[in-house]
C-alpha cells in the first residue's frame, strides 16, 4: 500500500467505504507543509484537503469523505505549486472495514454463537478468534455473515473471544486491511468474566552442552 515517488512514501486507507485517509512520509521535505489536492471524477477541478493530519506541526496526511459510488481517487501532493506526487487509484483496493458492532454471544452446550450487525456492503468475512488458557495461539473461525458458531468447546474452561471483519480477496484484492479487533470478551460456563488466566507458555527445553 506504499507508493514511492520523489522521496515520498504514500499510504492509502479506505475506512468502511466512508472515509479515505492518505498519509505520507516526506523524507525529502522536512519542515515543509505539503498540500493535498484531490477529486473523485476526472472532469472535476481538484479540491484542496480540508482535514489535514499533522505530525510534529507539519502536514502528513489528509482525511476526506467518500461515497460508496466514489471508486477512483485522483490526487496530487504538492510542495507549494510544485506537484511532488500525482496518482489515481481504485480506492477499494485499500478498504479497511469497521470493527464488528453490537457483538453478542449465545451459548448452547459445547458451542457459542457470536453475532453482530452485518456491514452494509458485500464481499466481507467475519472472523472470530478464541482461545483458552491451555492454547498458546488463537483458534479461528470465519463466515460470510456475522453469525459465527464455534463448536466443541469445553464449558468448564475460560475462553477469550475477539472478532474482526476482513475484505474478501475475491472481492477487493489481496492488499486490503482487516478491521481492528473488537474488545476481548471472556466467557466460562456460559457467563461473562473479566478475564481468563494468561495462556501457559510451554517451558523452554534446556540445551545440553
Amino acid at each position: 500500500q506504499v507508493a514511492t515517488g520523489e522521496g515520498l512514501q504514500i499510504q492509502i486507507m479506505y475506512f468502511n467505504l466512508e472515509t479515505v485517509q492518505v498519509t505520507w512520509n516526506a523524507s525529502h521535505y522536512p519542515r515543509s507543509n505539503l498540500s493535498f489536492h484531490y477529486k473523485f471524477s476526472r472532469d472535476e477541478a481538484y479540491d484542496q484537503c480540508t482535514v489535514y493530519i499533522l505530525q510534529e506541526g507539519h502536514t502528513s496526511g489528509c482525511l476526506l469523505d467518500a461515497e460508496q459510488q466514489d471508486d477512483i481517487l485522483y490526487f496530487s501532493i504538492r510542495n507549494g505549486t510544485h506537484p511532488v506526487f500525482t496518482a489515481s487509484r481504485w480506492i477499494f483496493y485499500y478498504l479497511k472495514p469497521s470493527s464488528p458492532k453490537q457483538v453478542s454471544f449465545s451459548w448452547h452446550q459445547d458451542a457459542v454463537t457470536l453475532t453482530c450487525s452485518d456491514l452494509s456492503y458485500r464481499g466481507l468475512l467475519y472472523e472470530v478468534q478464541y482461545r483458552s488458557p491451555f492454547d498458546t495461539e488463537w483458534q479461528s473461525k470465519q463466515e460470510n455473515t456475522c453469525n459465527v458458531t464455534v463448536e466443541d468447546l469445553d464449558a468448564e474452561k475460560c475462553y477469550a473471544f475477539r472478532a474482526r471483519v476482513k475484505a474478501m480477496e475475491d472481492a477487493y484484492g489481496p492488499d486490503t486491511y482487516p478491521s481492528d479487533w473488537s474488545e476481548v470478551t471472556c466467557w466460562q460456563r456460559g457467563e461473562t468474566r473479566d478475564s481468563c488466566p494468561e495462556p501457559r507458555t510451554p517451558p523452554k527445553p534446556k540445551l545440553s552442552k
Epitope: A3, A87, R89, Y93, A171, G173
Partner: antibody, heavy 122, light 107 residues
C-alpha cells in the same frame, strides 16, 4: 464455457467513427460483479486498456482517449459495443474484448476474444 | 499513469531451461500485478494474478513473485509452446496499464 467474439469493419477512414461489437456466449454480461472491457494492441505490440462497462452499466474510460470513446451494451443480445470517434491512423490496432475477473474491483482479464484488426486509412 | 517496465525485451532460451523475466512499476502497487502469455495468432491468456496466485488450467511450471514495485515471472522446464510474448499488467492504478512485453524466443 465463456467465449467472446469481436466483429466490425476492418477498414475505417480517418476522421470517421469506429464501431465494434463483442458478442459473449456461455456467460451473461449482467452477472453481478463482472466488468467487460476493450483493450487494443498497436502494431508494435503495445497493449492499451481502453475502457470498461460493468454488469450495472457503469462505464470507465482511459483518460488518454478523452471524450472520443463510448462503451454501451445490448443485454438482449448479450453484447457490448465500442464506439471511437474521430479516428486517425494512430488508432490502427488489433482490438480485443475481454472479461475482467470478478472482484478486486476490476482486476485481471481472464477471458479474451480473438481480436479484430482495424486499419485506419484513406 | 503507473508505468510498467519489462526486462529483458527479448529472452532467448532452449526447451528444458528455466527462465525469469521482470516487471518494474513506477509506483508501488502492492501485489496487484498480473501476467499474460500471448502466442502468435492466439488470444492472450492470463497466467498469474496478484503477483503469485495461480490460475486454474495454467501449468505449474509458471510462477510469479514480488510486491511493491518489483515483480518476476518464472517458467521452469520450458516447453515449445511457451515461446511467446509475456505481458505484465497492474490494476490498482487508474487507468490499468500493461508492460511493453518480453518476447521469449527459441535460441
Amino acid at each position: 464455457q465463456i467465449q467472446l467474439q469481436e466483429s466490425g469493419p476492418g477498414l475505417v477512414k480517418p476522421s470517421q467513427s469506429l464501431s465494434l461489437t463483442c458478442s459473449v456466449t456461455g456467460f451473461s454480461i449482467t452477472t453481478s460483479g463482472y466488468y467487460w472491457t476493450w483493450i487494443r494492441q498497436f502494431p508494435g505490440k503495445k497493449l492499451e486498456w481502453m475502457g470498461y462497462i460493468g454488469y450495472n452499466s457503469k462505464t470507465y474510460y482511459n483518460p488518454s482517449l478523452k471524450s472520443r470513446i463510448s462503451i454501451t451494451r445490448d443485454t438482449s443480445k448479450n453484447q457490448f459495443l465500442l464506439h471511437l470517434n474521430s479516428v486517425t491512423t494512430e488508432d490502427t490496432a488489433t482490438y480485443y474484448c475481454a472479461r475482467s475477473l470478478y472482484g478486486g474491483y476490476k482486476d485481471a482479464f481472464d477471458s479474451w476474444g480473438q481480436g479484430t484488426l482495424v486499419t485506419v486509412s484513406s | 499513469d503507473v508505468v510498467l517496465t519489462q526486462t529483458p525485451a527479448t529472452l532467448s532460451a532452449i526447451p528444458g531451461e528455466r527462465v525469469t523475466m521482470t516487471c518494474k512499476a513506477s509506483q508501488s502497487i502492492g501485489t496487484s500485478l498480473h501476467w499474460y502469455q500471448h502466442r502468435p495468432n492466439e488470444t492472450p491468456r492470463l497466467l498469474i494474478k496478484f503477483a503469485s496466485r495461480s490460475i486454474t488450467g495454467i501449468p505449474s511450471r509458471f510462477s510469479g513473485s514480488g510486491s511493491g514495485t518489483d515483480f518476476t515471472l518464472g517458467i521452469n522446464n520450458l516447453e515449445a509452446e511457451d515461446f511467446a510474448i509475456y505481458y505484465c499488467q497492474q490494476s490498482p492504478g487508474f487507468p490499468p496499464t500493461f508492460g511493453s512485453g518480453t518476447k521469449l524466443e527459441i535460441n
